[in-house]
Interface confidence: medium
């Protein structure tokens, strides 16, 4: 029946610890007498038997979902509007695999097994950005910001850790950034400063290490932003 179809991308790739939203639409004719029945949608892992296995996500409130995907996989779309969009946050390696959607409305029940979504979870290659506003002068305090702008709002907030031999204290913290107040000494020049970010929802960690450039106030103040390209190389942007 050409009226029975599901439209979703064949595969999606997400880095470990990050998030993805997969748009999805489904169609299925239903008998007139079920027009007022609620529409329940379910995402199942491939290989699941509907009567035996819990779904990874559903909008049915009294339906148990798989323990390992609870709170991370959400049926974000509204099935009553033919929307089966799936949200995955805190992606984990074990989320790798294929998933199929099932709809139930009254006596009409259908698993869209010929159009499955393949989820690929890859290594976290993104690294934190470290912002140093202006030159680091000996014995003068500066606010260094470590941020992960590529992380998503819906995920479990990351945990920031700083490592430095220089005298430091923690400043303001937002969901995706942490400020370190550093008061470098002349002997801290050339030493390492590391910002480590752990994504507890997936148990994955990423970090960036820079070398402190401590010098007496220069004529030409600059802002160093350590960005990198995820390859492990460090770039310096001067502004």
């Amino acid at each position: 029946d050409p009226r029975v179809r599901l439209e979703v991308q064949e595969s999606v790739t997400v880095q470990e610890g990050l998030c993805v939203l997969v748009p999805c639409t489904f169609f299925h004719p239903v008998p007139y007498h079920t027009r007022n029945s609620p529409v329940h949608g379910y995402w199942f892992r491939e290989g699941a038997i509907v009567s035996l296995d819990s779904p990874v996500a559903t909008n049915k409130l009294d339906q148990e979902v798989r323990e390992e995907t609870q709170g991370r996989f959400r049926l974000l779309g509204d099935p009553s509007r033919n929307n089966c969009s799936l949200s995955i946050v805190d992606a984990r390696r074990r989320d790798n695999g294929s998933y199929f959607f099932r709809m139930e409305k009254g006596s009409t029940k259908y698993s869209y097994k010929s159009t499955q979504l393949s989820v690929h979870v890859t290594d976290l290659t993104h690294r934190p950005q470290i912002l140093i506003p202006g030159a680091l002068d000996p014995d003068h305090s500066k606010n260094l910001t470590c941020s992960v702008p590529w992380a998503c709002e819906q995920g479990t907030p990351p945990i920031f850790s700083w490592m430095s031999a220089a005298p430091t204290s923690l400043g303001l913290r937002t969901t995706h950034s942490s400020v370190l107040i550093i008061t470098p000494r002349p002997q801290d020049h050339g030493t390492n400063l590391t910002c480590q970010v752990k994504f507890p929802g997936a148990g994955v960690t990423t970090e960036r290490t820079i070398q402190l450039n401590v010098s007496y106030a220069s004529q030409n103040p600059r802002t160093d932003i350590f960005l990198g390209d995820g390859s492990g190389k460090q770039g310096v942007v001067q502004g």
């Epitope: 892992r45 695999g97 698993s111 010929s114």
Partner: antibody
Framework: QVQLVQSGTEVKKPGSSVKVSCKVS????????ISWVRQAPGQGLEWMGR????????NYAQKFQGRVTITADKSTSTAYMELSSLRSEDTAVYYC??????????WGQGTMVTVSS | DIQLTQSPSSLSASVGDRVTITCRAS??????LAWSQQKPGKAPKLLIY???SLESGVPSRFSGSGSGTDFTLTISSLQPEDFATYYC????????FGQGTKLEIK
């Protein structure tokens, strides 16, 4: 091309256990569920249970609950079925089969298990 | 568990005949039904999945139909290699097989 290769013939005493292996080659082992199905001589097919290797969770037919254990070793792409407290009526050919949608699309060659005193 | 009842249990037919095997479920199973063929000493082979979808590599003379509780496997023109035992199996609630239909040469 995907293949399911099972371990060889077994002869067991009543009351003992048997463990049959099923090695998957030619495809991603953990993406699919693997079921075990048995067939007594001259009889029909009977589903015993199945495992989804990527999760490691198994489900069993009510008849075999408590007597069968299905496991999977992702490192060797091998599924196992262990049946305990064997009796003569467990004499059968045991097949592993790969789930594809709502069907078994690929089957192992079968393992004959004879239970005799 | 859902019971599947196949009929007939055995059937004699000739090459070129059109053959129909039915499978009735004890309760509705939507379209979660497959048909497989088994020859003596061999593992079963998938023919039809999702009640009516033909497995790749299976000749088009095989077709499946039905939904809910009543399903049919049809072989439009029997070939010598089609003489075997046919099983239906359901995947809607746990997994169960029909008792089989043995197709013999008349």
């Amino acid at each position: 091309q995907v293949q399911l290769v099972q371990s060889g013939t077994e002869v067991k005493k009543p009351g003992s256990s048997v463990k049959v292996s099923c090695k998957v080659s030619g495809d991603t082992f953990s993406s699919y569920a693997i079921s075990w199905v048995r067939q007594a001589p001259g009889q029909g097919l009977e589903w015993m249970g199945r495992i989804i290797p990527i999760i490691g969770i198994a489900n069993y037919a009510q008849k075999f609950q408590g007597r069968v254990t299905i496991t999977a070793d992702k490192s060797t792409s091998t599924a196992y079925m262990e049946l305990s407290s064997l009796r003569s009526e467990d004499t059968a050919v045991y097949y592993c089969a790969r789930h594809w949608l709502d069907a078994f699309d690929i089957w192992g060659q079968g393992t004959m298990v004879t239970v005799s005193s | 568990d859902i019971q599947l009842t196949q009929s007939p249990s055995s059937l004699s037919a000739s090459v070129g005949d059109r053959v129909t095997i039915t499978c009735r479920a004890s309760q509705g199973i939507s379209s979660a039904l497959a048909w497989s063929q088994q020859k003596p000493g061999k593992a079963p082979k998938l023919l039809i999945y999702d009640a009516s979808s033909l497995e790749s590599g299976v000749p088009s003379r095989f077709s499946g139909s039905g939904s809910g509780t009543d399903f049919t496997l049809t072989i439009s023109s029997l070939q010598p290699e089609d003489f075997a035992t046919y099983y239906c199996q359901q995947f809607n609630s746990s997994i169960t097989f029909g008792q089989g239909t043995k197709l013999e040469i008349k």
